[in-house]
Amino acid sequence: QFELEILSMQNVNGELQNGNCCGGARNPGDRKCTRDECDTYFKVCLKEYQSRVTAGGPCSFGSGSTPVIGGNTFNLKASRGNDRNRIVLPFSFAWPRSYTLLVEAWDSSNDTVQPDSIIEKASHSGMINPSRQWQTLKQNTGVAHFEYQIRVTCDDYYYGFGCNKFCRPRDDFFGHYACDQNGNKTCMEGWMGPECNRAICRQGCSPKHGSCKLPGDCRCQYGWQGLYCDKCIPHPGCVHGICNEPWQCLCETNWGGQLCDKDLNYCGTHQPCLNGGTCSNTGPDKYQCSCPEGYSGPNCEIAEHACLSDPCHNRGSCKETSLGFECECSPGWTGPTCSTNIDDCSPNNCSHGGTCQDLVNGFKCVCPPQWTGKTCQLDANECEAKPCVNAKSCKNLIASYYCDCLPGWMGQNCDININDCLGQCQNDASCRDLVNGYRCICPPGYAGDHCERDIDECASNPCLNGGHCQNEINRFQCLCPTGFSGNLCQLDIDYCEPNPCQNGAQCYNRASDYFCKCPEDYEGKNCSHLKDHCRTTPCEVIDSCTVAMASNDTPEGVRYISSNVCGPHGKCKSQSGGKFTCDCNKGFTGTYCHENINDCESNPCRNGGTCIDGVNSYKCICSDGWEGAYCETNINDCSQNPCHNGGTCRDLVNDFYCDCKNGWKGKTCHSRDSQCDEATCNNGGTCYDEGDAFKCMCPGGWEGTTCNIARNSSCLPNPCHNGGTCVVNGESFTCVCKEGWEGPICAQNTNDCSPHPCYNSGTCVDGDNWYRCECAPGFAGPDCR
């Protein structure tokens, strides 16, 4: 549109172009016009460019006029926004840039008989480009002087010197673009093409085998796979092979056959020859064992003195035969070595779709919820499990149940109620629907029915299992009793479930471990190893560290057994007079090599890392965001390129910051709408959208911009006794105990007398990470052997 604005008028004498006065006669004395002033208004005519302006002819580009806007002299420069002095001429053609403009000032006669009279006329031919800027023009000749300004502006979405270039931003199927100041389409991130409706696929997406409909996508053609559609799909069933083109199966080394499933090196892959037998490959999936003396069978598995190696498992008894041995299995077991549990689930005795679980010498039916009994033959009373949440009663039906709901509830379990949340909660609280009511879940620091006042976070007794609640600003902390941990003292881990102890050993649950109390004949962490008690042959004391026993396992017919007084970390050295000393392994010290030297003494772990002492070594448990042997390296949280849509990533400690571009928002510049999504704040933090940023309100025990850094307050002061190391675990802590101590805070002395280290009815005396044997009459030595 073409716009013209009258700025000022100077008609000092109030005269017309023809020399007459606007209103009335002249004063005979000074010849000035008397009575009233001119009633000035303006007419405008816009037409094609004329080098010699002609007053007549049509106003081909448009014409218009103002109402009466003043008298003889006026100035409208200050009165912006007053449309009375503006003429707007819209045009529906391409603006030609050059034009001729006729502007006339007229006096309104205010009556129907007398015609209006012209005061002054101006003409101007020129060239003007569309712009928001005004161009000022002046008429300085004749009886009146006036000033006006003009401009040409394009309609919305039209650009260029002719206002004929159309560009309307869009983000839909037909295009995804904005418009620059010249009306050129600028594609949104992820789109390309003249209309910005072709998606840019994932970087690296194979142009040959992949394509996409949405930015960052990569959809594979038939026969191709992988993140970038650059990996061929091998022939179905191809086992040890690869492909260069789809549906091939090119075998790896030592494999053959159409599906590369024939092992050409059976010996190397399976090592089938036992008891020192030598293996030779004889063909695909074929081999031959040559056995050492005393062994035979295809895998050298048959020993001449078969029962010596205790081949019968699961308490089976062994009988030597001409072919080797024979096992007589205990109930529930079968097979040549009693290692196969008899399948008591064949046939399946479980009714109504129950799942049969095979046990040793028996079975157990895992019944569907509606059935019970040994074989799921009884209709379960579902009402016993109290499935009806908000009901008057529960009625048991065959293979089902019926809940008679209380008013306001519905659903099979009467657990669906009517939503009463209608925006009553204040201070950004969220609303939880109740039965015929609601409850406001308040943000930190607020309480009351509508979250209108502050809260004592301990009022709801959140700490479980006798935990003591400590109220703090905007949060609470639970001080847990021994045996419990977690932010609400809710964790009590039972490491004995399922029971890891074998051979009938009893399991004892500890804070972060378990302990198996082995029967006489077994030892090891899980009581899985058979003990050699020297029960069958007499022993001879050689010195204070060694006994000898008759044995046909050695050429000399004697086997020497060393004392275990120095424990697993030292060797016994015999001294004169029946005494001994312990030669300790690296990393151990003390009379019985029972003390682990503290390798953490030099504080090697940096950046808040926690040092855990090992054997002649240490390990650093790094604070969140650090890595390396000494926690010296800040983990690059930008390595996975988390910032989308052209956002720039800046690495922080255990966090990153995305500097978003082009109106993208959120932690990873992933959203056009909101700064928040479910992944913005970690560890249960609540996200608040603050317009051009987000803010995380962290639960107790966490801090940092995204609740990503654990506060180490749970380890201050150190709760771990007897030199235990405290490791921060969110709002809680874990103690790594020194040897000889156990329990959640390392307060219990480990029972070093378990399992029975003293032989021949010796009595064990337990110390701090050591023990002493008091021997029965007739026996001596550190372990009464």
């Epitope: 979405y157 159309f166 839909d172 199927f173 003249p194």
Partner: antibody
Framework: QVQLQESGPGLVKPSQTLSLTCTVS??????????WSWIRQHPGKGLEWIGY???????YYNPSLKSRVTISVDTSKNQFSLKLSSVTAADTAVYYC???????????WGQGTLVTVSS | EIVMTQSPATLSVSPGDRATLSCRAS??????LAWYQQKPGQAPRLLIY???TRATGIPARFSGSGSGTEFTLTISSLQSEDFAVYYC????????FGGGTKVEIK
């Protein structure tokens, strides 16, 4: 005022190819920002978009018809065309050509032509 | 494919009364939605685009609202020439139309 006019046979035999042409008057098919589309309406049913062509020749087809559809443009004649191969009775419909407007929406439509698939 | 569902299938209204037509998308289409009017034997006519912007020459009694998945076309005072079938159409993905709502005289 832009006007669109469909033309082509009203009867096609099963398994043959349906061919229609849309002639545009009152405006150039080469004007940027417009997508020239084909839409069909089965008797007494709703509308189904078939595909579009841009003056540059780039196309996009409804995925359910993609294997059978070809849309082409002849800017010198100010026309664009539809070919639908291997037709069955289920392709019997009124076929419209339409312009997707510079702002949004199908702002100009042809009057439609009924194509019957029958032997 | 984004599926568009219109309700009701038929709406009986007296001349001069208000008519409210609903359209639901199977996933968010933001504001990329258009409404069309079709009379028997005629091609559809564009009424609304961008969910709420009236097309050129469309009377002010037609108004559109909504964004995301729920949209409404309102005819404030039905005239005799407004009795027709109305279709909604999304264009966030390749264009799909609703099944239509027939507005008939009560």
């Amino acid at each position: 005022q832009v006007q669109l006019q469909e033309s082509g046979p009203g009867l096609v035999k099963p398994s043959q190819t349906l061919s229609l042409t849309c002639t545009v008057s009152g405006g150039s098919i080469s004007s940027g920002g417009y997508f020239w589309s084909w839409i069909r309406q089965h008797p007494g049913k709703g509308l189904e978009w078939i595909g579009y062509i841009y003056y540059s020749g780039s196309t996009y087809y409804n995925p359910s018809l993609k294997s059978r559809v070809t849309i082409s443009v002849d800017t010198s004649k100010n026309q664009f065309s539809l070919k639908l191969s291997s037709v069955t009775a289920a392709d019997t419909a009124v076929y419209y050509c339409a312009r997707w407007g510079a702002a949004a929406g199908f702002d100009y439509w042809g009057q439609g032509t009924l194509v019957t698939v029958s032997s | 494919e984004i599926v568009m569902t219109q309700s009701p299938a038929t709406l009986s209204v007296s001349p001069g009364d208000r008519a409210t037509l609903s359209c639901r998308a199977s996933q968010s289409v933001r504001s990329n939605l258009a409404w069309y009017q079709q009379k028997p034997g005629q091609a559809p006519r564009l009424l609304i685009y961008g969910a709420s912007t009236r097309a050129t020459g469309i009377p002010a009694r037609f108004s559109g609202s909504g964004s995301g998945t729920e949209f409404t076309l309102t005819i404030s005072s039905l005239q005799s020439e407004d009795f027709a079938v109305y279709y909604c159409q999304q264009y966030t993905d390749w264009p799909t139309f609703g099944g239509g709502t027939k507005v008939e005289i009560k």
